[in-house]
Amino acid sequence: AQNITARIGEPLVLKCKGAPKKPPQRLEWKLNTGRTEAWKVLSPQGGGPWDSVARVLPNGSLFLPAVGIQDEGIFRCQAMNRNGKETKSNYRVRVYQIPGKPEIVDSASELTAGVPNKVGTCVSEGSYPAGTLSWHLDGKPLVPNEKGVSVKEQTRRHPETGLFTLQSELMVTPARGGDPRPTFSCSFSPGLPRHRALRTAPIQPRVWEPVPLEEVQLVVEPEGGAVAPGGTVTLTCEVPAQPSPQIHWMKDGVPLPLPPSPVLILPEIGPQDQGTYSCVATHSSHGPQESRAVSISIIEPGEEGPTAGSVGGSGLGTLA
């Protein structure tokens, strides 16, 4: 069979080889397409409800005024010339539709190095067959599941037209110290060959390099956090970051209802003050960062102070 590729909505003429150029003709066309079950026979004398999709022209050719998805299939003509010689024509028709230019929507203006970021979503509407979307970085293809690249794809089909909408969401993890203005683009490759790819306009997000966070240090006096009853404990939260973050305090994993301060003083320690303390530094740009936890415990005279304390009560300290 001869392969024919036709664009959806365009007319198509299939020649019936060996047919006399004008009536009377002894010929018939047989169709096996999405509009038929098994074979539908069309003849020159026909003329009827099928004319809107396929009709035999006076010269014996089959005319399809506007090819549709349902017209994909096999078309055969059997013709007899004036001398009684029989000729057969056989066509395999495939249809296609080129979508509009793909677009990148919901694109990010800024990416953070070292963490996964959504770059954007590439959308192509109105293709047939579906085709594929692919992403490019600085003109080179991006391979999903390699080097921090992941792609989420979705294909939808229009219930009436049968055309496809493709969506592809790109996630990347930019390398630290990499290109500060990478260029991303997306391209649609048609499902049928011999049609070139369609590419989106490029996007160039900035890559933001977060300053590596230095650890939040919690210093306790007396060292080890063991103190005699009535003694004083001073907890100091040291954060090298500038500007200084807000410091909040936690006891046994629960925030203490105190205003922010880098120093927490526990005077006249009693059993209710025993427990595990930590501080939380909140940076405007990073979010919260918690220190290690220290245990505060009471030692009776004559005991050696433990380095890890015991369960505490609910007393509140004072802030320096």
């Epitope: 038929t36 079950e37 409800p49 099928w50 004319d51 809107s52």
Partner: antibody
Amino acid sequence: EVQLVESGGGLVQPGGSLRLSCAASGFTFNNYWMTWVRQAPGKGLEWVASIDNSGDNTYYPDSVKDRFTISRDNAKNSLYLQMNSLRAEDTAVYYCARGGDIRVGLDVWGQGTLVTVSS
Amino acid sequence: DIQMTQSPSSLSASVGDRVTITCRASQDVGIYVNWFQQKPGKAPRRLIYRATNLADGVPSRFSGSRSGTDFTLTISSLQPEDFATYYCLEFDEHPLTFGGGTKVEIK
């Protein structure tokens, strides 16, 4: 809303002529074939004529061929049926319907207009 | 020409009954059959298109099926508003041919 409204029916003598009209709205008229169907009093439905989108091709059953002519004016979203040499057996309610080809069948109908052929 | 033989020509049924109407085509018409409902003094209304597809706004108690050249309209549970005349139509070839109609009456 898709709508078809017929007009032009009435009483006519045998051998006379009548022209029916159908005004279409609510859809892209020139995308569809159009069809006339009739129904004699107390009887079933009978196909009368069809016309393709462009108006280039028309189709009739033998019972009305050479007497009736279907036409359309896409600029006016209008369908027509010119009926000549009318007979008593043409008495019926005439309906205008959208479609008539394999893509649609007949999907939307007008309310009908009564044609009475009698002396 | 294709003949569409519709049966029965009339039937009596009660609300809640399952009703089946059949059209037999005299030759292959593929899937190109519509079903219509018509009430007295009104225009036909399409119920089923291409043999098995429910038209927009039509209650799901109506369904169409096909076996070769036999086409069936089924009303799964007859409602008071379903008492009417039903017609099939083949639109695979000219002349377009309607079945003779089935009048569904209250028992």
